[in-house]
């Protein structure tokens, strides 16, 4: 089970919202907190270790997932072309 904790939110830039979130999860052995279908979930620890973020299935159904350069995060591209970027820190 997981819960989202929002750390802060920056809406100062028009048409762009930057939010810092983390998830608290109780995961079984070999799993770790991650994101599946845009919600916090327990995922295979190997995915985090290898930074193959798209293997978490972090985007909604119908969206395309792509890794950012240096595997620093991922983008979810909606069918209409809108892109949501998530960076991992």
């Amino acid at each position: 089970t997981c819960e989202i904790v929002t750390l802060d939110r920056d809406s100062s830039q028009p048409r762009r919202t930057i939010a810092r979130q983390t998830a608290r999860c109780a995961c079984r052995k070999g799993q770790i907190a991650g994101t599946t279908r845009a919600r916090p979930a327990c995922v295979d620890a190997r995915i985090i270790k290898t930074k193959q973020w798209c293997d978490m299935l972090p985007c909604l159904e119908g969206e395309g997932c792509d890794l950012l350069i240096n595997r620093s995060g991922w983008t979810c591209t909606q069918p209409g072309g809108r892109i949501k970027t998530t960076t991992v820190s």
């Epitope: 079984r28 599946t36 279908r37 193959q52 798209c54 299935l57 985007c59 119908g62 395309g64």
Partner: antibody
Framework: QVQLQESGPGLVKPSETLSLTCTVS????????WSWIRQPPGKGLEWIGY???????NYNPSLKSRVTISVDTSKNQFSLNLKSVTAVDTAVYYC??????????????WGQGTTVTVSS | DIQMTQSPSSLSASVGDRITISCRAS??????LNWYQQTPGKAPRLLIY???TLQSGVPSRFSGGGSGTDFSLTITSLQPEDFATYYC?????????FGQGTKLDIK
Amino acid sequence: QVQLQESGPGLVKPSETLSLTCTVSGGSISSYYWSWIRQPPGKGLEWIGYIYPSGSTNYNPSLKSRVTISVDTSKNQFSLNLKSVTAVDTAVYYCARVNPFGYYYAMDVWGQGTTVTVSS
Amino acid sequence: DIQMTQSPSSLSASVGDRITISCRASQSISTSLNWYQQTPGKAPRLLIYGASTLQSGVPSRFSGGGSGTDFSLTITSLQPEDFATYYCQESASIPRTFGQGTKLDIK
């Protein structure tokens, strides 16, 4: 509506490699995990393995030394290779989509299955 | 590996009956359990995931319950199309394992 179709030879000789392909239509292969399952005649279901969008895999340890699952996102296909087959590998082979329902991973779309017989 | 054991292995019932199939895991899997239905010559069909959530399109006469190591699938008021083989499957570990199946036939 997502549909899966298995294809490949129905007859394989002992010691050879069984090769099957699953073609995904009506949806993107990169949005899910994908799986192979088999069912020997008159018996139950056996999970063979998963493949992730990146091409990473999880295999059943009982088959790990002989099995390879790969993905071709450009063709919306994923494949199964099982080497050094014997008669015990005779089965109906199914491909399936693995859907993450929240935290619960379940195979919610299946191909119709293809029968593979291992015989000389 | 986690072992999944179903009981009974076979079951005879009549249209309109209520039946329950049990599935036991060799170690705790929380609610990471799925149920499938398979009719002869067809691919399995997902009925229930997460131990108790009905898959879209599945009739409400099907229900699932349990957590930890003990689970059940109940069908109330059996219909002719329900006579099939049912499998439980855990989704908590690798390898994913299925129960051996329960064959439900007409009495």
